[in-house]
């Protein structure tokens, strides 16, 4: 692989990572906006950090850090940064694959766990403002009521439930959406993994090329 190929590889890696860094900035910014302006509340009391704002902030930050390493490592031809970029991507990829397998294997267990957590949160609706805010946001946005149905609200549905007599449950509706769009979710997940593998391959190739170029120049 010649100098021109090295340059091409270097700039492809740089521009793609720059693009991802900008995306990461947007996600982080949106997360911060949600944390400041929108109180979506806490749905799971045993996971108080699991809020929409926090999820966006964490995901955005990870994308920014990884993309930054990719950008700087490629443009500066820095082996240490490139290897850090490679290792981080590898960790993320392994985590994603592990998570996907666990979700697939323990789907029923997860359903039960989530349903229990949601049932607990329904019982806290009138006593906890954060839980109330979370439920009100979800029910208004998804046009649903309760976990599996309106009867989950044993003392009657709150005002955030649609006024129709027959309304789907929120968790039921979300589960149905995931199962109906399983193919698309799968395709998107595979595409993300492919992009990560490509990023890792490019970083490794560029790393090797930096070595070879250094030897050729006689450094």
């Amino acid at each position: 692989m010649g100098m021109s190929s090295l340059k091409l590889l270097k700039y492809v890696l740089f521009f793609f990572n720059l693009l991802f860094w900008i995306c990461g900035c947007c996600i982080l910014g949106f997360g911060i906006y949600l944390l400041i302006h929108n109180n979506f509340g806490v749905l799971f009391h045993n996971l108080p950090s699991l809020t929409l704002g926090n999820v966006f902030v964490i995901v955005g930050s990870i994308i920014m850090v990884v993309a930054f390493l990719g950008c700087m490592g490629s443009i500066k031809e820095n082996k240490c940064l490139l290897m850090s970029f490679f290792i981080l991507l590898l960790i993320i990829l392994l985590a994603e694959v592990t998570l996907a397998i666990l979700l697939f294997v323990y789907e029923q267990k997860l359903n039960e766990y989530v349903a229990k957590g949601l049932t607990d949160s329904i019982h806290r609706y009138h006593s906890d403002n954060s839980t109330k805010a979370a439920w009100d946001s979800i029910q208004s946005f998804l046009q649903c009521c309760g976990i599996n149905g309106t009867s989950d609200w044993t003392s009657g549905p709150p005002a955030s439930c649609p006024s129709d007599r027959k309304v789907e449950g929120c968790y039921a509706k979300a589960r149905l959406w995931f199962h109906s769009n399983f193919l698309y979710i799968g395709i998107i997940t595979i595409c993300v993994c492919v992009i990560e593998v490509l990023g890792m391959s490019f970083a490794l190739t560029l790393n090797c090329q930096i070595d070879k170029t250094s030897q050729t120049i006689g450094l």
């Epitope: 027959k166 789907e168 449950g169 509706k173």
Partner: antibody, heavy 118, light 112 residues
């Protein structure tokens, strides 16, 4: 025309489980909730709960939670109710009926008689 | 749970005479969508229940107009202007405004 056809008589032993079926014809199955109703002599009619076929949405009468479980198969237009840990108190006629935001308990199934006896 | 109190428990009527059944609920059946979800059902001997009246006063298609329903809030009435032989059976009121849905205890109509 619109019909709800239920499975035949079931004679069960105490502690066993039974799965009752309700096959819908003549309408869009996923557009209506399927309601389940219990009738015991001298006890009148009791609402057990409901399921929206093609969805995971269910509503149960608190009294029957843990006793009844609803499922539905959209491909065969059939709703099911499983009754677990049967006792003589579960001996009854079980009806399915349909319900929506526009039609209310307008079509009833033929009924399934469940007898629990040792 | 909403308790549906039906009176009388049994009714013996001569053919051609009127009949009236009352149903009282323990709380208002007015739903927040503005409708009152109260039905009247007839169960003939050995048959499945059959819908007669829905939304308090609306007559189900195919049901003779000698049947009529009225009421609001917590008090409801089913009237038969002229009883006929095929009207014998048990009449139930059903509320489906509040969970769990509940039925009246039933009124047995007999022919004198």
């Amino acid at each position: 025309q619109v019909q709800l056809q239920q499975s035949g008589t079931e004679l069960m032993k105490p502690g066993a489980s039974v799965k009752l079926s309700c096959k819908a014809t003549g309408y869009t199955f996923t557009g209506y909730w399927i309601e389940w109703v219990k009738q015991r002599p001298g006890h009148g009619l009791e609402w057990i709960g409901e399921i929206l076929p093609g969805s995971y949405s269910t509503n149960y009468n608190e009294k029957f939670k843990g006793k009844a479980t609803f499922t539905a198969d959209s491909s065969s237009n059939t709703a099911y109710m499983q009754l677990s840990s049967l006792t003589t108190e579960d001996s009854a006629i079980y009806y399915c009926t349909r319900d929506s935001n526009y039609e209310w308990f307008d079509v009833w199934g033929t009924g399934t008689t469940v007898t629990v006896s040792s | 749970d909403v308790v549906m109190t039906q009176t009388p428990l049994s009714l013996s009527v001569t053919i051609g005479q009127p009949a009236s059944i009352s149903c009282k609920s323990s709380q208002s059946l007015l739903h927040r969508d503005g409708e009152t979800y109260l039905n009247w059902l007839l169960q003939r001997p050995g048959q499945s229940p059959k819908l007669l009246i829905y939304l308090v006063s609306k007559l189900e298609s195919g049901i003779p107009d000698r049947f009529s329903g009225s009421g609001s809030g917590t008090d409801f009435t089913l009237k038969i202007s002229r009883v006929e032989v095929e009207d014998l059976g048990v009449y139930y009121c059903l509320q489906h405004t509040h969970f769990p849905y509940t039925f009246g205890s039933g009124t047995k109509l007999e022919i004198k």
